[in-house]
Amino acid sequence: CKAMHVAQPAVVLASSRGIASFVCEYASPGKATEVRVTVLRQADSQVTEVCAATYMMGNELTFLDDSICTGTSSGNQVNLTIQGLRAMDTGLYICKVELMYPPPYYLGIGNGTQIYVIDPEPCPDSDF
C-alpha cells in the first residue's frame, strides 16, 4: 500500500435545500484506470462511511446502496454532492481515494471538509 496526497476544502456550507458540494482532488502517481472514492463522516464519537463509488477513469461514478451522494469525475478530481442534509448532519466529511487498478495500490485520505448545515426557518403564516 502506497500513500497518496488528497486535497479537499476545509469548510463548506450546505445550501438551504440541504445540499453540499465539494471537490476531492488526488495526486495520482500513475495512470489509474479504476478508482474507488469513499466519503466518511467523523462526528458524534463515530466514523461512518456515508457513501462509496468505484469508477473507471472517464466514466461516471456509480454509488452503492440508496445513496445520498452523487458525483462526477474529471481527471484527478472528483466533484462530490451530498443531498438531504439537515442541521444534525453537520460534521467532518473525509474523502478517501483508492487507486485500485493497475497495481500498485495507492491510498489517500484527505483532512476532511467541515460541512455546516443550517435548517431553514419555516415560512411565517401569511394573510395573503
Epitope: D44, Q46, T48, E49, V50, C51, A52, D65, D66, S67
Partner: nanobody, 126 residues
Framework: EVQLVESGGGLVQAGGSLRLSCAAS????????MGWFRQAPGKEREFVAA???????SYKDSVVGRFTISRDNAKNTVYLQMNSLKPEDTAVHYC????????????????????WGQGTQVTVSS
C-alpha cells in the same frame, strides 16, 4: 421474522483477539443493515459497529483500527473481528438487524434495529 444467534465470545487476555459471528435466519439478510452493540454491567447498551447491505461500515471511535465488521451474504452471517482487546471491551455483545436507508445518524440508534440476538459474553482480563 428474523432470528439472530451470536457466537464466538469468551475469556481472553488483554491484547488478544476474538471473532464474533452472528447467524441470521428467517429474512432477506442481504437487505438488512447489521449492527453490533455491547452492554457492560451497570451501563447502557452502546453502539460498536455497523455494516450496510453493500458493505459500507461505521465504527465507534474507540474501536477504530482494532475492530473490523464484515458480512457474508451467502452465509447470512455478520462478523466482528476484535483485535488488541482491552479490559474496557468487557461486555455482552449483541447483534442487531434493521431495514432503513443507510445514514450516519441512524447506525448507532438502538431504535432503528428491529431484531436482536440474545448476546454473547466477551471478558477481557488484564
Amino acid at each position: 421474522e428474523v432470528q439472530l444467534v451470536e457466537s464466538g465470545g469468551g475469556l481472553v487476555q488483554a491484547g488478544g483477539s476474538l471473532r464474533l459471528s452472528c447467524a441470521a435466519s428467517g429474512g432477506t439478510f442481504s437487505s438488512y443493515a447489521m449492527g453490533w452493540f455491547r452492554q457492560a454491567p451497570g451501563k447502557e447498551r452502546e453502539f460498536v459497529a455497523a455494516i450496510s447491505p453493500s458493505g459500507l461500515t461505521s465504527y465507534k471511535d474507540s474501536v477504530v483500527g482494532r475492530f473490523t465488521i464484515s458480512r457474508d451474504n451467502a452465509k447470512n452471517t455478520v462478523y466482528l473481528q476484535m483485535n488488541s482487546l482491552k479490559p474496557e471491551d468487557t461486555a455482552v455483545h449483541y447483534c442487531a438487524a434493521g431495514q432503513w436507508t443507510w445514514s450516519p445518524l441512524r447506525v448507532s440508534r438502538l431504535a432503528e434495529y428491529n431484531y436482536w440476538g440474545q448476546g454473547t459474553q466477551v471478558t477481557v482480563s488484564s
